[in-house]
């Protein structure tokens, strides 16, 4: 009788991560008696994948019933394949021995290749906010894909960016790969509504790239511009001074009025007007009772925006131009603050 052959008909198979892989193996004879074992890799460091006689292999099932007397099919199915399962699998026939079985013949091996999708790209921006005209860096990461070939593109509001560097790791052969890219973006005052997009394309993706996004609203700080103006009011001896705080982002803003360097009132911006570009405007009023002042008054609008050093704008109020009421010692009138469109 011809000597037993172990036939692995598939030289190589490719499987998508998460699917099952069927590794085919048949023998041409029932003799010699002894079990079949499956290994990944060859040589002394090979890994046991399935042992017909003993052991617990929860992800492995046999394709046919190995308890049947004349069974010659020792194919196995491995469930929930991951990139870590890639390698060459050998179906090995052992001859019954005592105390140990003796390896008799091995199949030629089946190379299992695993294709895995990249994870959704994660885009992260700088830890601290930056102001327009500054260059900031964004990073994009995606992991777990195979094969290694992948393309990554950066966009800002649909316009492709060119200033970026990308690495795919590891450089050599691996069961799966990661991509890391850093893009440089120059901020403009109009970027509150802007988005930075990282787009990853891979053979496993059914046509559309995966996208990760970052909103520049989380990165940008647009400092306010200040304008202090004076309007007369109907009541004699009173002047309405307004501080217009324009085009700032984010909303966090505290305003302090100073009269001749002394704090008159501090308020936190509440009811804001939003501009089309996403920045905000705010207006604060100070009603000044001129008769309370003998000399000219220096009114200062001081704004602390988003924890940054305060910026201020001053206005000189000419007291001499107003008639004075004798004996009046009235403190500054109630200051009115409200939101008003510009």
């Amino acid at each position: 009788e011809e000597e037993l052959q172990v036939i692995q008909p598939d030289k190589s198979i490719s499987v998508a991560a998460g699917e099952s892989a069927t590794l085919h193996c048949t023998v041409t004879s029932l003799i010699p008696v002894g079990p079949i074992q499956w290994f990944r890799g060859a040589g002394p460091g090979r890994e046991l994948i399935y042992n017909q006689k003993e052991g617990h292999f929860p992800r492995v099932t046999t394709v046919s019933d190995l308890t049947k007397r004349n069974n010659m099919d020792f194919s196995i199915r491995i469930s929930n394949i991951t990139p870590a399962d890639a390698g060459t699998y050998y179906c090995v026939k052992f001859r019954k021995g005592s105390p140990d079985h003796v390896e008799f013949k091995s199949g030629a091996g089946t190379e299992l290749s695993v294709r895995a999708k990249p994870s959704a790209p994660v885009v992260s921006g700088p830890a601290a906010r930056a102001t327009p005209q500054h260059t900031v860096s964004f990073t994009c990461e995606s992991h777990g894909f195979s094969p290694r070939d992948i393309t990554l593109k950066w966009f800002k509001n649909g316009n492709e960016l060119s200033d970026f560097q990308t690495n795919v790791d590891p450089a050599g052969d691996s069961v799966s790969y990661s991509i890391h890219s850093t893009a440089k973006v120059v901020l403009t005052r109009e970027d509150v509504h802007s988005q930075v997009i990282c787009e990853v394309a891979h053979v496993t993706l059914q046509g559309d790239p995966l996208r990760g996004t970052a909103n520049l609203s989380e990165t940008i700080r647009v400092p306010p511009t200040l304008e202090v103006t004076q309007q007369p009011v109907r009541a004699e001896n009173q002047v309405n001074v307004t501080c217009q705080v324009r085009k700032f982002y984010p909303q966090r803003l505290q305003l302090t009025w100073l009269e001749n360097g002394n704090v008159s009132r501090t308020e936190t911006a509440s009811t804001l007007t939003e501009n089309k570009d996403g920045t905000y405007n705010w207006m604060s009023w100070l009603l000044v009772n001129v008769s309370a002042h003998r000399d000219d008054v220096k009114l200062t609008c001081q704004v602390e925006h988003d924890g940054q050093p305060a910026v201020s704008k001053s206005h000189d109020l000419k007291v001499s131009a107003h008639p004075k009421e004798q004996g009046s010692n009235t403190a500054p009138g109630p200051a009115l603050a409200s939101a008003a469109p510009l």
Epitope: S14, P147, A201, V203, Q206, G207, D208
Partner: antibody
Framework: QSVEESGGRLGQPGTPLTLSCTVS????????MGWFRQAPGKGLEYIGI?????SPYYASWVNGRFTISKTSTTMDLKMNSLRSEDTATYFC?????????????WGPGTLVTVSS | DIQMTQSPSSLSASVGDRVTITCRAS??????LAWYQQKPGKAPKLLIY???FLYSGVPSRFSGSGSGTDFTLTISSLQPEDFATYYC???????????FGQGTKVEIK
């Protein structure tokens, strides 16, 4: 799982024509689908694909002459203005489950003849 | 665009012969190459994908090899049903576009 083309006929130069590809046994929302053509006695030529979410991508030579779109069960190829060189058998095909680099399910083809 | 050059454009062989068809890409396509068989009046049939993986149901006499720019389709022992035209097809992962070779017609000697 299968795909089948329809809509091929004799058309006059300059007129539009729409071909359809009907699928069964799988969902168009899960796979990339492609259009190809083969002029009589010639080789296979790639026209374009449509992604699982409905984004079309075209071969560089198409230049807006063809439009690929899809509904839940059919994929269409609109030929905006027929030319004599468009005479060919048109095939639709589905990419493999492992990736978009090969096509494992092809329709039998539908013949388009352009003549005045 | 990538060009795919298939050779020979036609060949004559006998049943039982070993047949080799080659395909060369104008730039590297790594292993993104498929082989198809087409008979007159029929749709193409996938034989090999990813340069060397045999598609399910395809006889093991068909095999593929190569990577980068040079690829080979081998029929180890030609059978009567194998007389057909064979096409290679590339996919370029950067441009995400497909290109076919011009075809190789395998005829009976």
């Amino acid at each position: 799982q299968s795909v089948e083309e329809s809509g091929g006929r004799l058309g006059q130069p300059g007129t539009p024509l729409t071909l359809s590809c009907t699928v069964s046994g799988f969902s168009l929302s899960s796979y990339v689908m492609g259009w190809f053509r083969q002029a009589p006695g010639k080789g296979l030529e790639y026209i374009g694909i449509i992604s699982s979410s409905g984004s079309p991508y075209y071969a560089s030579w198409v230049n807006g002459r063809f439009t690929i779109s899809k509904t839940s069960t059919t994929m269409d190829l609109k030929m905006n203005s027929l030319r004599s060189e468009d005479t060919a058998t048109y095939f639709c095909a589905r990419v493999g489950p492992l990736g978009v680099d090969y096509f494992n399910i092809w329709g039998p083809g539908t013949l388009v003849t352009v003549s005045s | 665009d990538i060009q795919m050059t298939q050779s020979p454009s036609s060949l004559s062989a006998s049943v039982g012969d070993r047949v080799t068809i080659t395909c060369r890409a104008s730039q590297s396509i790594n292993s993104y190459l498929a082989w198809y068989q087409q008979k007159p009046g029929k749709a193409p049939k996938l034989l090999i994908y990813s340069a060397s993986f045999l598609y399910s149901g395809v006889p093991s006499r068909f095999s593929g090899s190569g990577s980068g720019t040079d690829f080979t389709l081998t029929i180890s022992s030609l059978q009567p049903e194998d007389f057909a035209t064979y096409y290679c097809q590339s996919w370029h992962y950067i441009s995400r576009s497909y290109t076919f070779g011009q075809g190789t017609k395998v005829e009976i000697k």
